[in-house]
């Protein structure tokens, strides 16, 4: 007799789930020498004690906290990108600009990056055809827990001059329900962090406003401000010679404003 | 059985651009990095570089930076090298190469090779 | 860089004899070292990683040892098919390096 299961509104497990986690995890040591020490059988083991047998609406920080530990790693704090809504042209950057990371160029952002899973209360099988949506369903599930608990650690790990990728193209450039909004905003320390830098990234090709003076814009310095975290604004105005800027500093084109 | 095969011979002039092929069969493609590793004639061996397939990111030897290019498409799991402003000294027979995560990080699985003649 | 220095270049055996060929890192490396062998015209094949342990495949016969910067490849009694050129790697950091290989010929 087939067991009743639970019907949630968002995407089931991504497929291979376990072998794409495993796989990203050599992966990530072979790229990055100074993490060989990692034992990704342990990590693997530690993301799937996470949520495996746990009802996908009831996932805590805590759930999280061995696989946090096995995921330690220390990037230079001064040389973090935050984004929002805009992440394939923050990767773009960081692939160009190789000091500086996005929370996707550390071993746990790696890991879970584009990926979706949950489990089941009581049964150790993984849920491939459905899990709860974030607004639908549930918000302690466990791809937004895992993403609220390594924001916040990468947010509080930032120092001196944070960088944060914004989308002009859209209605809220800054918008409070995001993650960088809800979490990382909230959790850059005061007594770390100098300032917040946001780069407005304009989609449009004759698109010259000063997008800065944005009333989202304006809503982020306010709540930086009153975090006693100086705030600064830039505009992006050609995103694809911003990057190419970014790969030859030295080309005659690149003094003018990007 | 893994498999990684790599295009035919080439032979360029000086200052062209030769694109090499290295289509993979037996695993899955996303899972693995892909190195490419140049052999000049009766020389030793030179790591070029690597590709994560899965998302695109590269990594050159300070050698070959500016003039190399690895790419990867997912649709047909092949991976590319790239190699522009040949010169004489390019001539060599050049390897896609991986490892095989369990095997350290030692190349586990290589092509067959693919010779590229820079002559003009 | 680190710079991977094999010694002999070329070294000439017997069939039966036990060679060893010498590799040093110019800076500590641990154990991230593999050995491999090649032969006229064709791609190079692992023997050795981890610089100890033996790949699939590999005739018990070749083992390696060492860490940090002093590695050795030994051939306990060489065979027919084992004369070919030999080249040791360091995977301990980018950009990743070889030696510059051992050519192991018939006396």
């Known amino acids: 007799v087939p067991r009743w299961r639970q019907q949630w509104s968002g995407p089931g497990t991504t497929k291979r789930f376990p072998e794409t986690v495993l796989a990203r995890c050599v992966k990530y040591t072979e790229i990055h020498p100074e993490m060989r020490h990692v034992d990704c059988q342990s990590v693997w083991d530690a993301f799937k004690g996470a949520f495996i047998s746990k009802h996908p609406c009831n996932i805590t920080e805590e759930d999280y906290q061995p696989l946090m530990k096995l995921g330690t790693q220390t990037v230079p704090c001064n040389k973090i990108l935050l984004w929002s809504r805009i992440k394939d042209l923050a990767h773009q950057f960081t692939q160009v600009q190789r000091d500086m990371f996005t929370l996707e160029d550390t071993l746990l952002g790696y890991l879970a990056d584009d990926l979706t899973w949950c489990g089941e209360f009581n049964t150790s099988k993984i849920n491939y055809q459905s899990c709860p949506d974030w607004r639908k369903d549930c918000s302690n599930n466990p791809v937004s827990v895992f993403w609220k608990t390594v924001s916040r650690r990468f947010a509080e790990a930032a120092c001196d001059v944070v960088h944060v990728m914004l989308n002009g193209s859209r209605s809220k450039i800054f918008d409070k329900n995001s993650t960088f909004g809800s979490v990382e905003v909230h959790n850059l320390q005061p007594e770390k962090v100098q300032t917040l830098e946001a780069w407005v990234i304009h989609g449009g090709r004759e698109d010259s406003r000063d997008l800065c003076q944005d009333p989202t814009i304006k809503e982020l310095e306010s709540i930086i401000s009153k975090r006693n975290i100086q705030f600064s604004c830039k505009n992006i105005y050609r995103p694809d010679k911003f990057l190419q800027c970014v790969k030859n500093p030295e080309d005659s084109s690149c003094t003018s404003e990007i | 059985e893994v498999q990684l095969v790599q295009s035919g011979a080439e032979v360029k002039k000086p200052g062209a651009t030769v694109k090499i092929s290295c289509k993979v069969s037996g695993y899955t493609f996303t899972d693995y990095i892909m190195h490419w590793v140049q052999q000049a004639p009766g020389k030793g061996l030179e790591w070029m570089g690597w590709i994560d397939p899965e998302y695109g990111r590269t990594d050159y030897a300070e050698k070959f930076q500016g003039r190399v290019t690895i790419t990867a498409d997912t649709s047909t799991d092949t991976a590319y090298m790239e190699l522009s402003s040949l010169r004489s000294e390019d001539t060599a027979v050049y390897y896609c190469?991986?490892?095989?995560?369990?095997?350290?990080?030692?190349?586990?699985?290589w092509g067959q090779g693919t010779l590229v003649t820079v002559s003009s | 860089d680190i710079q991977m220095t094999q010694s002999p270049s070329t070294l000439s055996a017997s069939v039966g004899d036990r060679v060893t060929i010498t590799c040093r890192a110019s800076e500590d490396i641990y154990s991230n070292l593999a050995w491999y062998q090649q032969k006229p015209g064709k791609a190079p094949k692992l023997l050795i990683y981890d610089a100890n342990s033996l790949a699939d495949g590999v005739p018990s016969r070749f083992s390696g040892s060492g860490s940090g910067t002093e590695f050795t490849l030994t051939i306990s009694s060489l065979q027919p098919d084992d004369f070919a050129t030999y080249y040791c790697q360091q995977y301990n950091n980018y950009p990743y390096t070889f030696g510059q290989g051992t050519k192991l010929e018939i006396k």
């Open positions: 190469a991986r490892s095989a995560h369990t095997t350290g990080f030692g190349f586990a699985y």
